[in-house]
Amino acid sequence: VKMAETCPIFYDVFFAVANGNELLLDLSLTKVNATEPERTAMKKIQDCYVENGLISRVLDGLVMTTISSSKDCMGEAVQNTVEDLKLNTLGR
Amino acid sequence: EICPAVKRDVDLFLTGTPDEYVEQVAQYKALPVVLENARILKNCVDAKMTEEDKENALSLLDKIYTSPLC
């Protein structure tokens, strides 16, 4: 949950690619005004996930989840929260 | 804002060598089945995507990272 809060559109696109869901990918890419060549590039990546099957998608999803919830990222998220709190306090 | 570790993972997936990408994944999930899968996906992407495709994917990622939705 925390990781999706840091950049929800990135995780929308990543999981659409990894799930092999073309419709979902199109919807996500529309949100960032992707050009046709950009869509083509993402669909080539999606093809690799589809060709390698369900286990492949699950394993790569596991990698992304693990990195996103690692101390490298969680430390970053905590730091950002601290900075936000400081700014909010200064702004009052 | 996207986490730098995630950004590095995606950058290496697109522009790194298979060894570089898998070594990076291994820092987070050192399971043979996961690492073999990561290499298979990386090899597939390298074979399917032209340099132009990779540039387009990187430009899309820039849009994602700078989007208000990120």
Epitope: - | D19, V22, E23, A26, A30, P32, L35, E36, N37, R39, I40
Partner: antibody, heavy 123, light 107 residues
């Protein structure tokens, strides 16, 4: 790019010893398990031994257990195969191979190979 | 040790042919199977791992399939550079074993 260079092969009498070396470059040596694989003249491939990325664990084929010892020097990016009590059936080209996938416990998939060094055991 | 048996031992084919090599394991190796290509006087080269995963730089005309005890390597359209000996290898155990090899020669 990954480069593996074996050396130390030659002609040796049965019962004698020989030490093979494999110098590695072009990759993060200390992250990968390393193997020796051999091929008798005109025959197929036979896995010989593996050493973990940090040298902590070693496995051997039954045919060489107790006679061969694999070791590595991560500061010099080199692995070794100490071969004792050599037999005629040990005659082969010995290849050094890098594991495809990094870190410990990874599967024995041979991603990169050296050019091989010939060991001939003959009286 | 798990025994790996390849068939045929020798295969005569022409450029453009579709070629299939079979590899059987004496017991299940799940999907932990690799294929290598070797040319005379050269070291083997990894083509495929985990049954169907193409290694970097290997052309798409090579493909692998199977699971358990029966596996195949297929070359969809044989090229002059493909005449070589092919080996399967299981890595289900930490005592990896190879098939005896299949030599693909010019008809």
């Amino acid at each position: 790019q990954v480069v593996l260079v074996e050396s130390g092969g030659g002609v040796v009498q049965p019962g004698r010893s020989l030490r093979l070396s494999c110098a590695a470059s072009g990759f993060t040596f200390s992250s990968y398990g390393m193997h020796w694989v051999r091929q008798a003249p005109g025959k197929g491939l036979e896995w010989v031994a593996v050493i973990w990325y940090d040298g902590s664990i070693k496995y051997y084929a039954d045919s060489v257990k107790g006679r061969f010892t694999i070791s590595r020097d991560n500061s010099n990016n080199t692995i070794y195969l100490q071969m004792n009590s050599l037999r005629a059936e040990d005659t082969a080209v010995y290849y050094c191979a890098r594991a495809l996938i990094p870190v410990a416990g990874t599967d024995p998939i041979f991603g990169y190979w050296g050019q091989g060094t010939l060991v001939t055991v003959s009286s | 040790d798990i025994q790996m048996t390849q068939s045929p031992s020798t295969l005569s084919a022409s450029v453009g042919d579709r070629v299939t090599i079979t590899c059987r394991a004496s017991q299940s190796v799940s999907s932990w199977l690799a294929w290598y290509q070797q040319k005379p006087g050269k070291a083997p080269k990894l083509l495929i791992f985990k049954t169907s995963g193409l290694e970097s730089g290997v052309p798409f005309r090579f493909s692998g399939s199977g699971s358990g005890t029966e596996f195949t390597l297929t070359i969809s359209s044989l090229q002059p550079d493909d005449f070589a000996t092919y080996y399967c290898q299981q890595y289900n155990t930490y005592s990896p074993t190879f098939g005896q090899g299949t030599k693909v020669e010019i008809k």
